[in-house]
Amino acid sequence: AITEAREEAKPYPLFPGPLPGSLQTDHTSLLSLPHTSGYQPALMFSPTQPGRPYTGNVAIPRVTSAGSKLLPPLAFKHTVGHIILSEHKDVKFNCSISVPNIYQDTTISWWKDGKELLGAHHAITQFYPDDEVTAIIASFSITSVQRSDNGSYICKMKINNEEIVSDPIYIEVQGLPHFTKQPESMNVTRNTAFNLTCQAVGPPEPVNIFWVQNSSRVNEQPEKSPSVLTVPGLTEMAVFSCEAHNDKGLTVSKGVQINIKAIPSPPTEVSIHNSTAHSILISWVPGFDGYSPFRNCSVQVKEVDPLSNGSVMIFNTSASPHMYQIKQLQALANYSIGVSCMNEIGWSAVSPWILASTTEGAPSVAPLNVTVFLNESRDNVDIRWMKPLTKRQAGELVGYRISHVWQSAGISKELLEEVGQNNSRAQISVQVHNATCTVRIAAVTKGGVGPFSDPVKIFIPAHGWVDHAPSSTPAPGNADPVLII
């Protein structure tokens, strides 16, 4: 918030020493020119003394057809050169010229700092004709002046392709100091020096700066704007502002909070989104960052099965997104999971721990000692196997999947059978005679299907052939057995 003090009564010149053609404002006009009622224009006066030769931009009229005599050169009359006034006051200034009546369609335009003032400006041109010349007075008024109205104003008139330009009228709006740079909120390291900058301008100048910390002035003597405050270090949060003083009063900058960087608060709301046999997807809500950006986070995973080792795994991850997929976990196991995040100061405490479980895994080993033989009398294939030594993480065995592929004369057909967990043998009907049947078996848990056993092949002869010799899983390293009858 900007605070403005009461405007001071004493005038304060913009430049040191007297300036010709310049005067403080807020007096009644000395010119008896018509002006819009309600205005109280500032005092205006000519920048040159009476009788002083004029050297401005003039138009030299051509010889008249009547008397072949030269008309005097056209020029704007001298007027006030410098107007000093306070913000929010009204001002009216003008320029005047006497134009011989031989000239028609004369228009006066107003310019500020080299740009024509068009549109919604209070510019009024009044004409006072007599026998030979017309006095033209162009008035320009500004209601409730602002700093942006500061500048050099001129009148221009075009006659016979000649441009007549008046002397400039300098408008100087004075007011309370105006901040061009205010201190900024900062997050700083404890007991570490930092700088704050404050800059304010008039007019009027000079502008002096006082610094304020937690409502108390820091500097006894003011510093001329701009001012840099070096704070040797803070141990706790503080609020700083600066006061800018000039002869019109004082303006106070916004108060800025200087925060002390600290370790972050622990993350909250650690949640489980998805669990598989060997991974858990978690998310969390970051805690307060301690006025310093998060750098990374650490996901801590602790085995909590009643009789686990209790191994602690720590996974480092980026601070964003606030999610992480924990991998390399054991199937069918319980874990306690916590998250901690760090900034430049250090690590937060660990979030509240949450419990999570992985699901059953698929078996990791295939059934053993698979044997296959043909029972020709029943026209089926008898399959036997041994239950695999499944790891407990695979969960409870729910059954077996039997794949049997029938190949004969370029035709190949795969069929799948499911049998219960208590079985260690199965019978499948012969699908094709004079063909090879290839059998593979996999154990199944709720976690999925395990690896298939090595293929065992048996030849199914045409009707009438008899064989009872089994085909079985090879010893490691042997080629797939094929029993041809």
């Epitope: 009643p306 009789l307 686990s308 080792n309 916590g338 409870e396």
Partner: antibody, heavy 114, light 107 residues
Framework: QVQLQQPGAELVKPGASVKVSCKAS????????MHWMKQRPGQGLEWIGR????????NYNEKFTDKATLTVDKSSSTAYMQLSSLTSEDSAVYYC???????WGQGTTLTASS | DILLTQSPATLSVTPGETVSLSCRAS??????LHWFQQRSHRSPRLLIK???DSISGIPSRFTGSGSGTDYTLSINSVKPEDEAIYYC?????????FGAGTKLELK
């Protein structure tokens, strides 16, 4: 190699408290649960509870919640079990063991007697 | 709490014999069963974990099997140093509970 060192014996008066120690070495102390078991003379084993030195997380057998307090000192890699309001029923051998109970201390024989 | 029932309470065998010790749980413990040997005046020693997983340094004559609620510890060709009390322990839920033990005596 992994070692769990316990004092051989503690003699305490009934009504008093005792703090049994278990000093660990040969492994990362903060990476394994520390369990405590009780075995009365000629009896079977009872599980008292466990503590995780990483964050002092504890689980107790409800039967021992008012009797035993488990703590750790990470700096010395030592686990402690404090037993309070001792009676003759507390006279037993107390074991510490880690992880899957593959490593056990030698046991501390506690005698509560006046 | 999960109750573990061990049988027999005592087993008397001749060296060289093969023996089977039984442990039955009051509910399914999903193979989270462990076997310990405790010789006289010694700390217990882990023999088998998770029903059938062998432990490094334990003689191969000790094997475990079972699932659900029924578990067995087999000792192939018993040796004199196997005389001890054998405990089963469930690690499925807290509190961890031990069986009452089976005492193996050698004739």
């Amino acid at each position: 190699q992994v070692q769990l060192q316990q004092p051989g014996a503690e003699l305490v008066k009934p009504g008093a408290s005792v703090k049994v120690s278990c000093k660990a070495s040969g492994y990362t102390f903060t990476n394994y649960w520390m369990h405590w078991m009780k075995q009365r003379p000629g009896q079977g084993l009872e599980w008292i509870g466990r503590i995780h030195p990483f964050d002092s997380d504890t689980n107790y057998n409800e039967k021992f919640t008012d009797k035993a307090t488990l703590t750790v000192d990470k700096s010395s890699s030592t686990a402690y079990m404090q037993l309070s309001s001792l009676t003759s029923e507390d006279s037993a051998v107390y074991y510490c063991a880690i992880g899957t109970l593959i490593y056990w201390g030698q046991g501390t024989t506690l005698t509560a007697s006046s | 709490d999960i109750l573990l029932t061990q049988s027999p309470a005592t087993l008397s065998v001749t060296p060289g014999e093969t023996v089977s010790l039984s442990c039955r749980a009051s509910q399914s413990i999903y193979k989270k069963l462990h076997w310990f040997q405790q010789r006289s005046h010694r700390s217990p020693r882990l023999l088998i974990k998770f029903a059938s997983d062998s432990i490094s340094g334990i003689p191969s004559r000790f094997t475990g099997s079972g699932s659900g609620t029924d578990y067995t510890l087999s000792i192939n060709s018993v040796k004199p140093e196997d005389e001890a009390i054998y405990y089963c322990l469930q690690g499925y839920s807290t509190p961890l509970t031990f069986g009452a033990g089976t005492k193996l005596e050698l004739k």
